[in-house]
């Protein structure tokens, strides 16, 4: 399945929107820095079947969407930027779902990769727990925003590798 050209444009737009969501200087939040243990190994170039990669990418985007679609995020971040961010994430999810639907006869897709999916979910659970412990402070959101930018970039790299394999 070919992810449309608009998919990579959407990725770039999502990253720009995340960058624009910055409200305070990261330097004022150095004491709040935290290692969320991004599951890098799930995004490294191991011998992923395409359906596995799509499933992991979908999970990454859905969990990002969940994280930014709570009332706490609406209170802390610019709502106009959030709404635009949602549009990009939803488009990404639709593209990936479309892809899985096309792949489905060939590869037994969504259920085979539970460990990879769980690793992504646990990563987001750590982020949510951190935000809760920090009482959703502006510095906590800044740390999380920067973290999601980093992880989003890594997932974009996986998508690029997928495309180059086609």
């Amino acid at each position: 399945c070919d992810l449309p050209q608009t998919h990579s444009l959407g990725n770039r737009r999502a990253l720009i929107l995340l960058a624009q969501m910055r409200r305070i200087s990261p330097f004022s939040c150095l004491k709040d820095r935290h290692d969320f243990e991004f599951p890098q190994e799930e995004f490294d170039d191991k011998q992923f079947q395409k359906a596995q990669a799509i499933s992991v990418l979908h999970e990454m985007i859905q969990q990002t969407f969940n994280l930014f679609s709570t009332k706490d995020s609406s209170a802390a971040l610019d709502e106009t930027l959030l709404d635009e961010f949602y549009i990009e994430l939803d488009q990404q999810l639709n593209d990936l779902e479309s892809c899985v639907m096309q792949e489905v006869g060939v590869i037994e897709s969504p259920l085979m990769y539970e460990d990879s999916i769980l690793a992504v979910r646990k990563y987001f659970q750590r982020i949510t727990l951190y935000l809760t412990e920090k009482k959703y402070s502006s510095c906590a959101w800044e740390v999380v925003r920067a973290e999601i930018m980093r992880s989003f970039s890594l997932s974009i790299n996986l998508q690029k590798r997928l495309k180059s394999k086609e």
Epitope: I54, E59, Q62, E114
Partner: antibody, heavy 126, light 110 residues
């Protein structure tokens, strides 16, 4: 766990419109779709449409296009179903339903209905 | 558009017996997007099996799902009194998202 609470029973005249609401509480995300499913007396289940509350994006079943409008508020998370030009055969229990964020993977979670409202009876009668 | 046909319409059985319910699709459906629900009189449907064969939380292991392509089954190994109900299969297709239900199979006490 998600709880879905629907508005009360309604009696409507043919040709009029009805609006049913569904308030979600618990572990809710506006990033997951809320669907409307109806069930006529003694009949099976029929999917009507869904909304993604975060965006207001809707998808409607072919049978209802032109008569159905689904809307949502993000806070408190509430979905609304409006059905116009009511006919006698629209007499049914109307359920709102949503997927589960716990099902692995998420790509599977949105393909099903894990949580259901208690149902709202709409009677079309002259 | 996919049509799901369930058979039989009604199944009359005694507690302790096994039941096999069929759901046939008019075109291929990935088993991952095939779901089963149980509905008792006066109640909302309840998620039973998803992904073709995964049991939802709290569903006893006497319920199992199987099949692929166009033919799917829900099996209840030993019917308990609380199992008597109407069972629906449901499929999902995208894009755009479309959810389709079968017409239901009623499992009643003989």
């Amino acid at each position: 766990e998600v709880q879905l609470l629907e508005s009360g029973a309604e009696v409507k005249r043919p040709g009029s419109s009805v609006r049913v609401s569904c308030r979600a509480s618990g572990d809710t995300f506006s990033s997951y779709p809320i669907s409307w499913v109806r069930q006529a007396p003694g009949q099976g289940l029929e999917w009507m449409g869904r909304i993604l509350p975060a965006l207001g994006v809707t998808n409607y079943a072919q049978n209802f296009r032109g008569r159905i409008t689904i809307t949502a508020d993000k806070s408190p998370l509430t979905a609304y179903l409006e059905l116009s030009s009511l006919r006698f055969e629209d007499t049914a229990v109307y359920y709102c339903a949503s997927p589960s964020a716990d099902i692995i993977p998420s790509i599977l979670g949105t393909t099903l209905f894990a949580f259901w409202g208690q149902g709202s009876l709409v009677t079309v009668s002259s | 558009e996919i049509v799901l046909t369930q058979s039989p319409g009604t199944l009359s059985l005694s507690p302790g017996e096994g039941a096999t319910l069929s759901c046939r699709a008019s075109q291929n459906v990935s088993r991952h997007y095939l779901t089963w629900y149980q509905q008792k009189p006066g109640q909302s449907p309840r998620l039973l099996i998803y992904g073709g064969s995964s049991r939802a939380t709290g569903v006893p292991d006497r319920f199992s799902g199987g099949g692929s392509g166009t033919d799917f089954t829900l099996t209840i190994s030993r019917l308990e009194p609380e199992d008597f109900a109407v069972f629906y299969c449901q499929s999902y297709h995208s894009p755009p998202p479309v959810y389709t239900f079968g017409q239901g199979t009623k499992v009643e006490i003989k």
